[in-house]
Interface confidence: low
Amino acid sequence: CEEPPTFEAMELIGKPKPYYEIGERVDYKCKKGYFYIPPLATHTICDRNHTWLPVSDDACYRETCPYIRDPLNGQAVPANGTYEFGYQMHFICNEGYYLIGEEILYCELKGSVAIWSGKPPICEKVLCTPPPKIKNGKHTFSEVEVFEYLDAVTYSCDPAPGPDPFSLIGESTIYCGDNSVWSRAAPECKVVKCRFPVVENGKQISGFGKKFYYKATVMFECDKGFYLDGSDTIVCDSNSTWDPPVPKCLKVLPPSSTKPPALSHSVSTSSTTKSPASSASGPRPTYKPPVSNYPGYPKPEEGILDSLD
């Protein structure tokens, strides 16, 4: 027989020879990182027809790392469903908890023993520091010092000292989200008042009033013989300006060489009208999120979030 077969999990005891006589036996042992479980044979014999009798390495099992229980409030998920060396253990936390430590541990061979590459992580409850206080306003639960995951607070504006009220700019409700960061920037309370919109050769058809506060919406149409240059709908935005700008009504001039088009009494040059929330003008305020400062809690990324108008 020629050289005996080679295997992934077991190796020949001694050095292989170029050829073996009929009846000669070779023995294998489990490779490093594998252990033998009886009773399967780990030897073979050179048969009369010059082939080796069948043998497999099924008796050699990969070393396994110690069992890891699910962390409290989370899960340990073995990749490929095995604890054998060369594989990974993934850790995930339940909703409302975040991982402290390694998300993945590797089952590694140290000598002949399979051990994990590090300590299992833990799942810690998501907690937020109190949300920011805002000028001219307040939020619910202002006496609470620690907020849990999905706890929500709602902002409202104080009564204004003058004739015009404070408007709440942004979302009134925010909640404690993943990574111990509030779901969005705190809103703003300020007086927002747009000038009375005057359109010559046109008229207001909705949104009548003497004062125009935040998100007030006005619609226009032009007099007969005039067409609308701009949007027929405008909204008072957070900077006390109309968005889009107040339109104009321009006179329809008949073309010199062609028949005038049949016009209705108002024509808009704008093919689409913007919804109140679809645009903003002027600089957008920025806000740095609160940073968790409880011992054992990692600081969230110190990014800057845009406030939502």
Epitope: T64, I68, V113
Partner: antibody, heavy 122, light 111 residues
Framework: QVQLQQPGAELVRPGASVKLSCKAS????????INWVKQRPGQGLEWIGN????????NYNQNFKDKATLTVDKSSSTAYMQLSSPTSEDSAVYYC???????????????WGQGTSVTVSS | DIVVTQSPASLAVSLGQRATISCRAS??????????MNWFQQKPGQPPKLLIY???NQGSGVPARFSGSGSGSDFSLNIHPMEEDDPAMYFC?????????FGSGTKLEIK
């Protein structure tokens, strides 16, 4: 379901070593530690040691280091504890119990055998 | 070794009332944010039965009247309301590190 089966009683002559068995079933034997606990009549519980069947790694209570030897037979899912040179002080109930592992600490002994009552007497 | 001190040694409680057993470890048994303190119930002629693991988690099939609390080195087991089936020896045990150590036990009886 998880079961740890132990013989009910063993009578031992002083000085003659005895090997207690604990046969596990209903779970993956190599994935949990097997612990041994001693309880003398009317007394508390004393942890002797534990063994991890996958690689036969052992931890011993120093008080039992020279008294107990822990082994396993993976093929039969059985754990053993051999008590050497028994004296009347070794007369007690010996329990085997399974435990789970977490990092460098252990969860509780969640399943127990019924215990083997060892009597050392001439 | 971590020494576990349990009190009281014995306790008599009326049916329907609350029983509280305390356990103190000679050092903190917290690790990875988990308290490795466990509680067992043992009735005569039977092996110990796991009641509470990791300080406050109920073992499988354990009635809700058994609850555990505490962290660091101070722990307690509460039984409320006390029922006919509850008289037994109760042991606490730390599993933070080997050797595991047990409290000396509390004998709970009906008053």
């Amino acid at each position: 379901q998880v079961q740890l089966q132990q013989p009910g009683a063993e009578l031992v002559r002083p000085g003659a070593s005895v090997k207690l068995s604990c046969k596990a079933s209903g779970y993956t034997f190599t994935a949990f530690w097997i612990n041994w606990v001693k309880q003398r009549p009317g007394q508390g519980l004393e942890w002797i040691g534990n063994i991890y069947p996958s690689d036969s790694y052992t931890n011993y209570n120093q008080n039992f280091k020279d008294k107990a030897t822990l082994t396993v037979d993976k093929s039969s899912s059985t754990a053993y504890m051999q008590l050497s040179s028994p004296t009347s002080e070794d007369s007690a109930v010996y329990y085997c119990a399974r435990s789970d592992y977490y990092g460098s600490s252990y969860y509780a002994l969640d399943y127990w055998g019924q215990g083997t009552s060892v009597t050392v007497s001439s | 070794d971590i020494v576990v001190t349990q009190s009281p040694a014995s306790l008599a409680v009326s049916l329907g009332q609350r029983a509280t057993i305390s356990c103190r470890a000679s050092e903190s048994v917290d690790n990875y944010g988990i308290s490795f303190m466990n509680w067992f119930q043992q009735k005569p002629g039977q092996p110990p039965k796991l009641l509470i693991y990791a300080a406050s988690n109920q073992g499988s099939g354990v009635p809700a009247r058994f609850s555990g609390s505490g962290s660091g080195s101070d722990f307690s087991l509460n039984i409320h309301p006390m029922e006919e089936d509850d008289p037994a020896m109760y042991f606490c045990q730390q599993s933070k590190e080997v050797p595991f150590t047990f409290g000396s036990g509390t004998k709970l009886e009906i008053k």
